[in-house]
């Protein structure tokens, strides 16, 4: 940390005679510079030079060859590297007065006569005298205005809107300034800044529009930072809205956007009269062309039980906005003919959610469902197969005689989804078939009995059992079962010999 530079003469203020010369020396541990009252155009008679000495310190000398009233003011010596735009200059100061009997007040630029006051805040009317001893009064249309005066700054106080004149008398001669105009501007201690980007996603060739609005403040400086700033791509506009309250709307427009215009768009607002700063940022993405992404929350094979409720939710990211439709087996889904509803909802700027709701699943709802999302640049789809699971049921159980051979075939037709398994059981003691323990599962490897299964279609199966010879009455049970349930039916097989006896009787 460097100690502050020092100034010779080592005084807070100094009165210098008109037209005389004066010099100020600054000593520092690093390179030092001077800040002084006049602008560079006016400072032809101010010379600044570096001086060598053997103290090891850096020395910069400011020399004025002929002092005038305009040289009255604050001279500051500071370290070069410590100066930032943000902060007040840190350094060592000396105030120089150059009294001039013909110039009572230090000359000012035209903008200094405009005094901006924030709501009921104190302000300075900057009429500074060239001589610290000169008495000064402040006047407005109503007369003398009581306010505290400092010859280095001017009058400090709370002033109402309107013109003010400073008056001084030097050696019996009266001097008046031109009027200082006090303007009241709306300015709050906090900046109320809002950023709005109606869109944050664009494609090449579109126009990016971002706005920043400042509320209840007229004293604002707003700067934009954005990817195309270096190329000066953006067009900025300011609209002032006064009703119902003050609102400054700054708009940045970037026409003919390209992918390179993707990035952060930032507006930084600063209050002109206070060190209040507020920033807002939005990220804009520009795509070469439109896009669509489909993200289902379920798999490509889905099962639903008969009569169940089921939701299928699909998330879609797309730009430009997509048209979303549902198909069933490649045909447009006609909702009013089914117990199915669909809807599409915009969740965020480029995010959509579509739901297909099965209100009461039926067998005929099985099939391939496709969601199609399309815009002018892309088409995407997602297809899934829906299987309505139906408990197994037996449609038919019949027997078939093989004439004189005494063989018999029993056919059992069952349906269900998934396709039912068919099991056969037999009960050889017909009188005891009411007792479950009398039934035995028919094994496939029994020599004189053949079992076979044929699928008729996706949901119907036929099982056959062939008995080479039935010598006594037996009962046969067909058991059809799948994940959702089981059903069985029984049939009595009578031996051919017994049957012929029955027929004769």
């Amino acid at each position: 940390q460097l100690s502050l530079p020092s100034i010779l003469p080592n005084e807070n203020e100094k009165v210098v005679q008109l037209n005389s010369s004066f010099s100020l020396r600054c000593f520092g541990e690093s390179e030092v510079s001077w800040q002084y009252p006049m602008s560079e155009e006016e400072s032809s008679d101010v010379e600044i030079r570096n001086e060598e000495n053997n103290s090891g310190l850096f020395v910069t000398v400011l020399e004025v060859s002929s002092a005038s009233a305009a040289h009255t003011g604050l001279y500051t010596c500071y370290y070069n590297h410590t100066q930032t735009e943000e902060n007040e200059l840190e350094g060592r100061h000396i105030y120089i007065y150059v009294p001039d009997p013909d110039v009572a007040f230090v000359p000012l630029g035209m903008t200094d006569y405009l005094v901006i006051v924030e709501d009921d805040d104190s302000a300075i009317i900057p009429c500074r005298t060239t001589d610290p001893e000169t008495p000064v009064t402040l006047h407005n249309s109503e007369g003398v205005v009581p306010a505290s005066y400092d010859s280095r700054q001017g009058f400090n106080g709370t002033f109402t809107v309107g013109p003010y004149i400073c008056e001084a008398t030097v050696k019996g001669k009266k001097f008046q300034t031109i009027p200082f105009n006090v303007y009241a501007l709306k300015a709050t201690s906090e900046l109320d800044l809002e950023m709005e980007a109606l869109k944050t996603v664009y494609k090449s060739g579109e126009t990016i529009v971002v706005t920043c609005a400042v509320f209840n403040n007229e004293v604002v400086d707003l700067q934009w930072t954005y990817p195309g700033e270096v190329k000066g791509k953006g067009i900025t506009m300011l609209e002032e809205i006064k009703v119902p309250s003050i609102k400054l709307v700054y708009t940045l427009t970037v026409p003919e956007a390209t992918v390179k215009d993707s990035g952060d768009y930032e507006c930084a607002a600063r209050q002109a009269t206070r060190e209040v700063k507020e920033m807002k940022k939005v990220t804009i993405s520009v795509h070469e062309k439109g896009f669509i992404e489909i993200k289902p929350t379920f798999s490509q094979l889905e099962a639903v039980n008969l009569h169940e409720v089921k939701h299928f939710v699909v998330e879609v990211r797309a730009y430009p906005p997509p048209r979303i439709s549902w198909l069933k087996n490649n045909l447009t889904l006609i909702e009013n003919l089914t117990e199915i509803t669909t809807d599409v909802e915009k969740i965020q700027e480029i995010r959509y959610r579509s739901k297909l709701k099965l209100i009461r699943a039926k067998e005929e709802d099985s099939g391939h469902y496709t969601i199609v999302a399309q815009n002018e640049d892309a088409v995407k789809s997602y297809t899934f197969e829906l299987l309505t699971q139906v408990p197994s049921s037996i449609l038919d159980l019949v027997d078939d005689h093989h004439g004189s051979t005494g063989g018999q075939t029993v056919r059992c037709t069952a349906e269900g989804t998934p396709l039912p398994d068919i099991e056969w059981m037999i009960c050889k003691d017909i009188k005891k078939c009411n007792n479950e323990t009398s039934w035995t599962i028919l094994a496939n490897n029994v020599s004189n009995i053949i079992t076979e299964i044929h699928s008729r279609d996706r949901s119907t199966v036929e099982g056959r059992v062939t008995f080479a010879k039935v010598e006594e009455t037996i009962a046969v049970r067909c058991l059809a079962k799948n994940l959702l349930g089981a059903e069985n039916r029984e049939l009595k097989l009578v031996a051919p010999t017994l049957r012929s006896e029955l027929t004769v009787a």
């Epitope: 039980n305 169940e308 409720v309 939701h311 509803t341 809807d343 709701k357």
Partner: antibody
């Protein structure tokens, strides 16, 4: 936070209609179905139907078919349930409930609206 | 319609007791079942969804189990604020149906 605020108690004569409102806040109204459930004093709960606020699709329980109408006004995020041809046995507290689509189960309920049907 | 049979219809218990409430569905409903708590004059509050998932913010003393046709709500250690009516709801098929409710009272 998610809130469902229902309209105040109603007293109706038999044969009249009642319209109960359910104002939703704290979430995207159109993203979740609204169901209506009623509960007669000291009794269990009875489901009346559902409505999708985005599409306007509805589904009603068989016993209310023809008497109940569920609608919505998305601009004010409000769902409505109108029950017509009121009878004394319709005296109950009527609840709206938000159906979470991921679990398809009610996760938030309104505070209830007492409807009294009396001559 | 699916019938939901809830038992018991009421029970008396003391603070600290373990309480079990059962719901049976007249047909399989997978895990499409939720449990709710209701206090007098108040709207129901969801405790359990998908048969066994605990709603966030609900104390861990509440748990749910079961699938298909038999479901259970268990309160491991009854607290004073748990005295209320509990009911189940199946959302497997329309119409949605509720259990008759179980009133948990102080012994």
């Amino acid at each position: 936070q998610v809130q469902l605020v229902q309209s105040g108690a109603e007293v109706k004569k038999p044969g009249a209609s009642v319209k109960v409102s359910c104002k939703a806040s704290g979430y995207t109204f159109t993203s979740y179905d609204i169901n209506w459930v009623r509960q007669a004093t000291g009794q269990g709960l009875e489901w009346m139907g559902w409505m999708n606020p985005n599409s306007g699709n509805t589904g009603y329980a068989q016993q209310f078919q023809g008497r109940v109408t569920m609608t919505r006004n998305t601009s004010i995020t409000t769902a409505y349930m109108e029950l017509s041809s009121l009878r004394s046995e319709d005296t109950a507290v009527y609840y709206c409930a938000r159906e979470e689509y991921s679990s398809s189960l009610f996760d938030s309920w309104g505070q209830g609206t007492l409807v009294t049907v009396s001559s | 319609d699916i019938q939901m049979t809830q038992s018991p219809s009421s029970l008396s218990a003391s603070v600290g007791d373990r309480v079990t409430i059962t719901c049976r569905a007249s047909q399989g409903i997978r895990n499409n079942l939720g449990w709710f708590q209701q206090k007098p004059g108040k709207a129901p509050k969801r405790l359990i969804y998908a048969a066994s998932s605990l709603q966030s913010g609900v104390p861990s003393r509440f748990s749910g189990s079961g699938s298909g046709t038999k479901f259970t709500l268990t309160i491991s250690s009854l607290q004073p604020e748990d005295f209320a009516t509990y009911f189940c709801l199946q959302h497997n098929r329309y119409p949605l149906t509720f259990g008759g409710g179980t009133k948990v009272e102080i012994k």
